[in-house]
């Protein structure tokens, strides 16, 4: 039907970004972002700049990285504004009500913009080989760039559900993204998977007055485990529960709790291990006797304030059709995903299995993590 985002990613702060390879004029790109429920992206200092650069660096577009690419962003100089040679943005400004970070912490200009006080001018982000950001470049608004960047702002996000026995996970985000992995999902994201026996399961991230949670998620995992152990959210057998140092690296599945030996799971209330342990001290006890489902908190650092853009997509407001196959010739329906963890977020899986996620604004930074979902 039409192409998905080439790549997209969300930070724990609630900001999501998507990168699109599509030859179009600035006005059409701006409309494309709005129709997706976002806006043409600002690329301010700090976390936002890092998130966008990470998206670009995740891989070349349809050209295979053979040429420089130009991407529309929400940077322009209005008709009545002059070129300012000594300013970092040269008199251009971001189309956003929030002043954001220091404009001095920005990319360089690939070419100095023409001196003018009359004509409106737009600017693009030039990427060498389509992946390495070179800097800003003035461009007439009616010309066509190679692509564009969108930004979406959400108040809350759902942390990724733990798979358990699930396979073939597929995420469908509301702003046109198919992916096999998404650490943080905006409301409206649908996760589908297969449980044992090829039984399909589907859960949706929904926002309510408490926060964001996975609707229809019974228990704390997508598919219950046949056994009693989980490692990194997936079902595991006891022999696979020892880490390199001999420590117990698993947690107990629903209905089980950590035995007294600290390295095996027993039926809740039993108190004695059904599988013997060697008494190796537990380095990371995943559960307590009072909590069969571990209370999990994600301490994630924040680097940007919430509400950076006036647009706050709502899951049932913006509907964009999602294609079966991206037009730009990728071999699967998956897209490369870029995650930047940039906010102090508290996300808790409650005993009922719902996820509560809220954000507290702080000012520290984090290194973006890349997930290539096409090979996941």
């Amino acid at each position: 039907e039409h192409p998905t985002a080439d790549r997209a990613g969300c930070s724990a702060s609630g900001a999501c970004y998507s990168l699109h390879h599509a030859t179009m004029k600035r006005q059409a790109a701006e409309e494309a972002c709005i129709l997706r429920g976002g806006a043409l992206s600002t690329v301010r200092a700090g976390a936002e700049l890092r998130a966008v650069l990470a998206l670009l660096r995740a891989g070349p577009g349809p050209g295979g990285g053979s040429k420089d690419l130009l991407f529309w962003v929400a940077l322009e100089r209005r008709r009545s504004h002059c070129t300012l040679e000594n300013e970092p943005l040269r008199g251009f400004s971001w189309l956003s009500s929030d002043p954001g970070g220091l404009e001095s912490d920005t990319l360089q200009w690939v070419e100095e913009p023409q001196r003018s006080c009359t004509a409106r001018r737009c600017a693009v982000l030039q990427a060498t080989g389509g992946v390495e950001p070179a800097g800003w470049k003035e461009m007439r608004c009616h010309l066509r760039a190679n692509g564009y960047l969108c930004k979406y702002q959400f108040e809350v996000l759902c942390p990724a559900p733990r798979p358990g026995a699930a396979s073939n996970l597929s995420y469908r985000a509301p702003f046109q993204l198919h992916s096999a992995a998404l650490d943080f999902s905006p409301p409206g994201t649908e996760v589908s998977a297969l449980c044992r026996g090829q039984l399909p399961i589907s859960v949706t991230c929904i926002a309510d007055e408490i926060g964001a949670r996975w609707d229809k998620l019974s228990g704390d995992v997508l598919c219950p485990c046949p056994g009693r152990y989980l490692r990194a959210g997936k079902c595991a057998e006891l022999p696979n529960c020892l880490d390199d140092l001999g420590g117990f690296a698993c947690e107990c599945a629903t209905g089980f709790e950590l035995g007294k030996d600290g390295r095996s799971c027993v039926t809740s209330g039993e108190g004695q291990p059904t599988l013997g342990g060697t008494g190796v001290p537990t380095r990371r006890p995943p559960a307590t006797a009072t909590s069969p489902v571990p209370q999990r908190t994600w301490p994630i650092r924040v680097d940007e304030k919430l509400g950076e853009t006036p647009l706050v997509p709502e899951q049932d407001n913006s509907v964009t059709s999602i294609p079966e196959i991206p037009r730009w010739g990728s071999q699967s329906t998956m897209s490369t995903l870029q995650m930047s963890l940039q906010a102090e977020s508290k996300a808790t899986i409650t005993p009922s299995g719902s996820v509560i996620s809220k954000f507290n604004s702080t000012t520290s930074s984090a290194t973006p993590q890349a997930f290539d979902s096409s090979s996941a």
Partner: antibody, heavy 118, light 108 residues
Framework: EVQLQQSGTVLARPGASVKMSCKAS????????MHWVKQRPGQGLEWIGA????????SYNQKFKGKAKLTAVTSTSTAYMELSSLTNEDSAVFYC???????????WGQGTSVTISS | QIVLTQSPAIMSASLGERVTMTCTAS???????LHWYQQKPGSSPKLWIY???NLASGVPARFSGSGSGTSYSLTISSMEAEDAATYYC?????????FGGGTKLEIK
């Protein structure tokens, strides 16, 4: 000059499907979004969705998802909207509109009137 | 979904009279993304005012638009017979695009 020429009046039965066309001229068809708007008799305007002919990117109002399907043929500069599972609620005039450089729907087709009757 | 409420739904004005109609949004809309359309019976809507205050090509100077945030208005400084029509406000600050219910302006 930008012109949008829409296909003629349609009379259809409940449950059937109809496909209407909008032929564009006077501009580069693949460079601008084409929007579709519904207007029931004596009522206001309702946005259905949009298509970008340059890459067939589409976006729909949730209300019309599954009801309307937007397509475009670049070789003839023609946009199409197909309406399925027709009911009396689909009796309306449907407009195609050009989304222009003023960030608004600056040109409109003359409308296609659809009447559903058994 | 942003709901646009137009008032009054119907109004009548004498020739030469000053006319003002309003459009209230359920949540804030950027002034760049608020437009007005004029529609006469049997005709397609026409872009009348774009980005809150800019007159579309061919629109008489007696028309003006203003507003910000959630409150916008269209004003005719001196009503003329050809101004009798229905006026719709429209936003695209957030998808889906929405229209107001319209204000029908009649000659008194």
């Amino acid at each position: 000059e930008v012109q949008l020429q829409q296909s003629g009046t349609v009379l259809a039965r409940p449950g059937a499907s109809v496909k209407m066309s909008c032929k564009a001229s006077g501009y580069t068809f693949t460079s601008y979004w084409m929007h579709w708007v519904k207007q029931r008799p004596g009522q206001g305007l309702e946005w259905i969705g949009a298509i970008y002919p340059g890459n067939s990117d589409t976006s729909y109002n949730q209300k019309f998802k599954g009801k309307a399907k937007l397509t475009a043929v670049t070789s003839t500069s023609t946009a199409y909207m197909e309406l399925s599972s027709l009911t009396n609620e689909d009796s309306a005039v449907f407009y195609c509109t050009h989304y222009g450089s003023d960030y608004a729907m600056d040109y409109w087709g003359q409308g296609t009137s659809v009447t559903i009757s058994s | 979904q942003i709901v646009l409420t137009q008032s009054p739904a119907i109004m009548s004005a004498s020739l030469g009279e000053r006319v003002t109609m309003t459009c209230t949004a359920s949540s804030s809309v950027s002034s760049s993304y608020l437009h007005w359309y004029q529609q006469k019976p049997g005709s397609s809507p026409k872009l009348w005012i774009y980005s809150t205050s800019n007159l579309a090509s061919g629109v008489p100077a007696r028309f003006s638009g203003s507003g910000s945030g959630t409150s916008y208005s269209l004003t005719i400084s001196s009503m003329e017979a050809e101004d009798a029509a229905t006026y719709y406000c429209h936003q695209y600050h957030r998808s889906p695009r929405t229209f107001g219910g319209g204000t029908k302006l009649e000659i008194k």
